[in-house]
Protein backbone atom coordinates (compact mmCIF):
# COMPACT_ATOMS: atom_id res chain seq x y z
CA UNK A 1 0.00 0.00 0.00
CA UNK A 2 1.29 3.53 -0.75
CA UNK A 3 1.74 5.90 2.20
CA UNK A 4 0.97 9.63 2.01
CA UNK A 5 3.79 11.50 3.77
CA UNK A 6 1.92 14.77 3.26
CA UNK A 7 -0.93 16.05 1.12
CA UNK A 8 1.31 16.42 -1.92
CA UNK A 9 3.66 13.42 -1.73
CA UNK A 10 2.82 9.71 -1.70
CA UNK A 11 5.62 7.18 -1.32
CA UNK A 12 6.04 3.42 -1.66
CA UNK A 13 8.08 1.61 0.98
CA UNK A 14 7.45 -1.94 -0.22
CA UNK A 15 6.65 -3.43 -3.59
CA UNK A 16 4.20 -6.17 -4.47
CA UNK A 17 5.94 -9.48 -5.09
CA UNK A 18 3.07 -10.73 -7.27
CA UNK A 19 2.63 -9.96 -10.94
CA UNK A 20 -0.77 -8.34 -11.53
CA UNK A 21 -2.75 -9.24 -14.63
CA UNK A 22 -3.18 -6.22 -16.95
CA UNK A 23 -6.90 -7.03 -17.11
CA UNK A 24 -7.11 -6.01 -13.43
CA UNK A 25 -5.36 -2.66 -13.94
CA UNK A 26 -7.15 0.63 -14.56
CA UNK A 27 -4.34 3.21 -14.40
CA UNK A 28 -0.93 4.00 -12.94
CA UNK A 29 1.10 6.90 -11.71
CA UNK A 30 4.83 7.35 -11.30
CA UNK A 31 6.49 8.19 -7.99
CA UNK A 32 9.72 10.07 -8.63
CA UNK A 33 9.88 12.48 -5.69
CA UNK A 34 13.28 12.71 -4.02
CA UNK A 35 11.34 12.84 -0.75
CA UNK A 36 10.55 9.14 -1.26
CA UNK A 37 13.05 6.35 -0.59
CA UNK A 38 12.37 4.58 -3.89
CA UNK A 39 11.14 5.45 -7.34
CA UNK A 40 7.94 3.50 -7.81
CA UNK A 41 4.77 2.88 -9.80
CA UNK A 42 1.39 2.90 -8.11
CA UNK A 43 -1.13 0.84 -10.06
CA UNK A 44 -4.83 1.43 -9.49
CA UNK A 45 -6.90 -1.70 -10.05
CA UNK A 46 -10.40 -1.86 -11.52
CA UNK A 47 -11.71 -2.16 -7.95
CA UNK A 48 -9.84 1.07 -7.00
CA UNK A 49 -7.16 -0.67 -4.91
CA UNK A 50 -3.72 0.97 -5.10
CA UNK A 51 -0.66 -1.26 -5.34
CA UNK A 52 3.01 -0.28 -5.21
CA UNK A 53 5.22 -1.90 -7.84
CA UNK A 54 8.91 -1.85 -8.74
CA UNK A 55 9.37 0.04 -12.04
CA UNK A 56 12.57 -1.88 -12.73
CA UNK A 57 10.61 -5.11 -13.16
CA UNK A 58 9.76 -5.99 -16.73
CA UNK A 59 6.10 -6.81 -16.01
CA UNK A 60 5.68 -3.33 -14.49
CA UNK A 61 7.17 -1.63 -17.56
CA UNK A 62 5.02 -3.87 -19.81
CA UNK A 63 1.88 -3.01 -17.82
CA UNK A 64 2.65 0.72 -18.08
CA UNK A 65 3.11 0.29 -21.84
CA UNK A 66 -0.20 -1.56 -22.10
CA UNK A 67 -2.07 1.12 -20.13
CA UNK A 68 -0.46 3.93 -22.14
CA UNK A 69 -1.55 2.31 -25.39
CA UNK A 70 -5.05 1.73 -24.00
CA UNK A 71 -5.41 5.41 -23.07
CA UNK A 72 -4.25 6.52 -26.53
CA UNK A 73 -6.56 4.14 -28.44
CA UNK A 74 -10.07 5.61 -28.82
CA UNK A 75 -12.81 3.22 -27.68
CA UNK A 76 -15.25 2.24 -30.48
Amino acid sequence: QPDAINAAVTCCYNFTNRKISVQRLASYRRITSSKCPKEAVIFKTIVAKEICADPKQKWVQDSMDHLDKQIQTPKP
Epitope: R30, T32, S34, E39, P55, K56, D65, D68, Q72
Partner: antibody, heavy 117, light 107 residues
Framework: QVQLVQSGAEVKKPGSSVKVSCKAS????????MHWVRQAPGQGLEWMGR????????KFDPKFQGRVTITADTSTSTAYMELSSLRSEDTAVYYC??????????WGQGTTVTVSS | DIQMTQSPSSLSASVGDRVTITCKAF??????RAWYQQKPGKAPKLLIH???SLEHGVPSRFSGSGSGTDYTLTISSLQPEDFATYYC?????????FGGGTKVEIK
Protein backbone atom coordinates in the same frame (compact mmCIF):
# COMPACT_ATOMS: atom_id res chain seq x y z
CA GLN B 1 18.35 16.42 -1.13
CA VAL B 2 19.67 14.44 -4.10
CA GLN B 3 23.09 15.43 -5.41
CA LEU B 4 25.20 13.91 -8.17
CA VAL B 5 28.83 15.03 -8.09
CA GLN B 6 31.04 14.19 -11.05
CA SER B 7 34.80 13.96 -11.42
CA GLY B 8 36.83 16.79 -12.91
CA ALA B 9 37.66 17.81 -16.48
CA GLU B 10 39.91 15.55 -18.58
CA VAL B 11 42.15 16.13 -21.59
CA LYS B 12 42.85 12.96 -23.56
CA LYS B 13 44.75 11.89 -26.66
CA PRO B 14 42.92 10.28 -29.61
CA GLY B 15 42.79 6.50 -29.23
CA SER B 16 42.95 6.60 -25.43
CA SER B 17 40.17 6.02 -22.86
CA VAL B 18 38.49 8.19 -20.25
CA LYS B 19 36.64 7.16 -17.10
CA VAL B 20 34.23 9.61 -15.48
CA SER B 21 32.74 9.08 -12.03
CA CYS B 22 29.44 10.22 -10.54
CA LYS B 23 28.93 10.05 -6.78
CA ALA B 24 25.34 10.18 -5.52
CA SER B 25 24.17 11.45 -2.17
CA UNK B 26 20.65 11.74 -0.83
CA UNK B 27 19.51 8.56 -2.56
CA UNK B 28 20.30 4.87 -2.71
CA UNK B 29 21.53 4.26 -6.24
CA UNK B 30 20.22 0.68 -6.26
CA UNK B 31 16.69 2.18 -6.21
CA UNK B 32 17.12 3.97 -9.51
CA UNK B 33 18.89 3.72 -12.86
CA MET B 34 21.99 5.79 -13.52
CA HIS B 35 22.21 7.21 -17.04
CA TRP B 36 24.92 8.96 -19.02
CA VAL B 37 24.12 11.76 -21.48
CA ARG B 38 26.63 13.81 -23.44
CA GLN B 39 26.60 17.19 -25.12
CA ALA B 40 29.16 18.25 -27.73
CA PRO B 41 30.10 21.96 -27.79
CA GLY B 42 27.14 24.00 -29.09
CA GLN B 43 25.16 20.83 -29.78
CA GLY B 44 22.17 19.01 -28.35
CA LEU B 45 21.85 16.19 -25.82
CA GLU B 46 22.65 12.57 -26.62
CA TRP B 47 21.75 9.60 -24.39
CA MET B 48 24.59 7.08 -24.19
CA GLY B 49 23.29 4.37 -21.89
CA ARG B 50 22.29 3.39 -18.38
CA UNK B 51 22.94 0.90 -15.60
CA UNK B 52 20.74 -0.73 -13.00
CA UNK B 53 23.19 -0.65 -10.05
CA UNK B 54 21.14 -3.38 -8.33
CA UNK B 55 22.10 -6.11 -10.79
CA UNK B 56 24.58 -4.32 -13.12
CA UNK B 57 22.31 -4.75 -16.15
CA UNK B 58 23.19 -2.16 -18.79
CA LYS B 59 21.53 -0.76 -21.89
CA PHE B 60 23.28 1.40 -24.51
CA ASP B 61 22.58 3.42 -27.59
CA PRO B 62 23.86 1.05 -30.33
CA LYS B 63 25.99 3.97 -31.54
CA PHE B 64 28.18 3.56 -28.43
CA GLN B 65 27.90 -0.23 -27.99
CA GLY B 66 31.34 -1.78 -27.65
CA ARG B 67 33.05 1.53 -26.90
CA VAL B 68 31.32 2.50 -23.67
CA THR B 69 31.34 0.68 -20.33
CA ILE B 70 29.02 1.72 -17.51
CA THR B 71 29.62 0.35 -14.03
CA ALA B 72 28.39 1.14 -10.53
CA ASP B 73 29.55 0.56 -6.98
CA THR B 74 26.57 0.51 -4.60
CA SER B 75 28.87 0.53 -1.54
CA THR B 76 30.10 4.01 -2.46
CA SER B 77 26.95 5.12 -4.37
CA THR B 78 29.11 5.84 -7.40
CA ALA B 79 28.47 5.24 -11.10
CA TYR B 80 31.21 5.22 -13.72
CA MET B 81 31.29 5.68 -17.48
CA GLU B 82 34.35 4.67 -19.49
CA LEU B 83 34.65 5.58 -23.16
CA SER B 84 37.43 3.99 -25.20
CA SER B 85 39.03 4.61 -28.61
CA LEU B 86 38.49 8.33 -28.18
CA ARG B 87 38.31 10.59 -31.22
CA SER B 88 37.96 14.34 -31.58
CA GLU B 89 34.16 14.02 -32.01
CA ASP B 90 34.00 12.69 -28.43
CA THR B 91 34.92 16.13 -27.11
CA ALA B 92 31.86 16.95 -25.03
CA VAL B 93 30.39 17.55 -21.60
CA TYR B 94 29.39 14.20 -20.08
CA TYR B 95 26.51 14.16 -17.60
CA CYS B 96 25.28 11.47 -15.26
CA UNK B 97 21.58 11.53 -14.43
CA UNK B 98 19.13 9.41 -12.49
CA UNK B 99 15.69 8.02 -13.22
CA UNK B 100 14.02 4.65 -13.72
CA UNK B 101 11.36 5.81 -16.19
CA UNK B 102 13.61 7.01 -18.99
CA UNK B 103 13.47 10.70 -18.07
CA UNK B 104 16.08 12.38 -15.92
CA UNK B 105 15.06 13.98 -12.66
CA UNK B 106 18.49 14.84 -11.27
CA TRP B 107 21.72 15.58 -13.14
CA GLY B 108 25.38 15.83 -12.26
CA GLN B 109 27.18 19.11 -12.90
CA GLY B 110 28.89 17.68 -16.01
CA THR B 111 32.45 16.65 -16.82
CA THR B 112 34.23 18.23 -19.77
CA VAL B 113 36.27 15.74 -21.81
CA THR B 114 38.55 17.23 -24.45
CA VAL B 115 40.12 14.90 -27.04
CA SER B 116 43.10 16.52 -28.68
CA SER B 117 46.46 15.46 -30.04
CA ASP C 1 15.69 5.03 -32.91
CA ILE C 2 12.74 7.39 -32.56
CA GLN C 3 13.71 10.73 -34.08
CA MET C 4 12.45 13.88 -32.35
CA THR C 5 12.15 17.04 -34.45
CA GLN C 6 11.87 20.25 -32.46
CA SER C 7 10.82 23.64 -33.81
CA PRO C 8 11.69 26.40 -34.00
CA SER C 9 15.44 26.01 -33.42
CA SER C 10 15.48 29.53 -32.00
CA LEU C 11 13.06 32.33 -31.28
CA SER C 12 13.18 35.90 -29.99
CA ALA C 13 10.55 36.99 -27.50
CA SER C 14 9.86 39.67 -24.91
CA VAL C 15 9.07 39.37 -21.21
CA GLY C 16 5.34 38.66 -20.86
CA ASP C 17 5.03 36.93 -24.26
CA ARG C 18 3.36 33.56 -24.68
CA VAL C 19 5.88 31.13 -26.15
CA THR C 20 5.13 27.78 -27.82
CA ILE C 21 7.72 25.15 -28.72
CA THR C 22 6.73 22.03 -30.64
CA CYS C 23 8.22 18.58 -30.85
CA LYS C 24 7.31 15.90 -33.39
CA ALA C 25 8.18 12.25 -32.88
CA PHE C 26 8.62 10.01 -35.92
CA UNK C 27 6.28 7.47 -34.31
CA UNK C 28 3.68 7.40 -31.54
CA UNK C 29 5.39 7.84 -28.14
CA UNK C 30 2.19 7.56 -26.07
CA UNK C 31 2.83 10.71 -24.01
CA UNK C 32 6.20 9.39 -22.85
CA ARG C 33 8.03 12.65 -23.30
CA ALA C 34 9.84 15.12 -21.11
CA TRP C 35 10.83 18.77 -21.45
CA TYR C 36 14.05 20.23 -20.06
CA GLN C 37 15.43 23.74 -19.65
CA GLN C 38 19.17 24.35 -19.98
CA LYS C 39 21.10 27.51 -19.24
CA PRO C 40 24.66 28.11 -20.53
CA GLY C 41 27.27 26.11 -18.60
CA LYS C 42 24.63 24.30 -16.55
CA ALA C 43 23.07 20.84 -16.58
CA PRO C 44 19.56 20.49 -18.00
CA LYS C 45 16.65 20.81 -15.58
CA LEU C 46 13.54 18.65 -15.84
CA LEU C 47 10.37 20.71 -16.30
CA ILE C 48 7.64 18.28 -17.37
CA HIS C 49 7.36 14.53 -17.80
CA UNK C 50 4.62 12.31 -19.09
CA UNK C 51 1.21 13.65 -20.08
CA UNK C 52 1.22 16.85 -18.00
CA SER C 53 3.29 16.17 -14.85
CA LEU C 54 4.94 19.44 -13.87
CA GLU C 55 8.09 18.76 -11.88
CA HIS C 56 8.03 19.90 -8.25
CA GLY C 57 9.06 23.56 -7.99
CA VAL C 58 8.52 24.36 -11.67
CA PRO C 59 6.31 27.47 -12.11
CA SER C 60 2.77 26.91 -13.39
CA ARG C 61 3.41 29.18 -16.38
CA PHE C 62 5.06 26.09 -17.96
CA SER C 63 2.68 23.54 -19.40
CA GLY C 64 2.84 20.57 -21.70
CA SER C 65 0.25 19.20 -24.08
CA GLY C 66 -0.10 16.85 -27.01
CA SER C 67 -0.52 13.17 -27.79
CA GLY C 68 0.54 10.62 -30.36
CA THR C 69 3.46 12.14 -32.25
CA ASP C 70 2.90 15.88 -31.62
CA TYR C 71 3.78 17.64 -28.37
CA THR C 72 3.98 21.25 -27.23
CA LEU C 73 5.67 23.15 -24.42
CA THR C 74 3.98 26.47 -23.62
CA ILE C 75 5.30 29.28 -21.44
CA SER C 76 2.21 31.39 -20.77
CA SER C 77 4.04 34.58 -19.77
CA LEU C 78 7.77 34.63 -20.39
CA GLN C 79 9.89 35.77 -17.43
CA PRO C 80 13.52 37.03 -17.50
CA GLU C 81 14.75 33.75 -15.97
CA ASP C 82 13.11 31.72 -18.78
CA PHE C 83 15.61 32.78 -21.44
CA ALA C 84 17.37 29.45 -22.06
CA THR C 85 17.46 26.46 -24.40
CA TYR C 86 14.62 23.93 -24.19
CA TYR C 87 14.80 20.26 -25.17
CA CYS C 88 12.12 17.62 -25.61
CA UNK C 89 12.95 13.96 -25.05
CA UNK C 90 11.08 10.71 -25.68
CA UNK C 91 11.22 7.90 -23.14
CA UNK C 92 8.87 5.51 -24.90
CA UNK C 93 11.73 3.30 -26.06
CA UNK C 94 15.48 3.13 -25.74
CA UNK C 95 17.67 4.58 -27.07
CA UNK C 96 16.05 7.65 -25.52
CA UNK C 97 16.30 10.57 -27.91
CA PHE C 98 16.18 14.35 -27.63
CA GLY C 99 14.97 17.07 -29.94
CA GLY C 100 17.59 19.42 -31.33
CA GLY C 101 16.71 22.20 -28.85
CA THR C 102 15.01 25.59 -29.03
CA LYS C 103 16.97 28.63 -27.92
CA VAL C 104 14.69 31.32 -26.46
CA GLU C 105 16.40 34.69 -26.74
CA ILE C 106 15.51 38.23 -25.66
CA LYS C 107 13.97 40.34 -28.42
Amino acid sequence: QVQLVQSGAEVKKPGSSVKVSCKASGLTISHTYMHWVRQAPGQGLEWMGRIDPDNHNTKFDPKFQGRVTITADTSTSTAYMELSSLRSEDTAVYYCARGVFGFFEHWGQGTTVTVSS
Amino acid sequence: DIQMTQSPSSLSASVGDRVTITCKAFEDIYNRRAWYQQKPGKAPKLLIHGATSLEHGVPSRFSGSGSGTDYTLTISSLQPEDFATYYCQQFWSAPYTFGGGTKVEIK
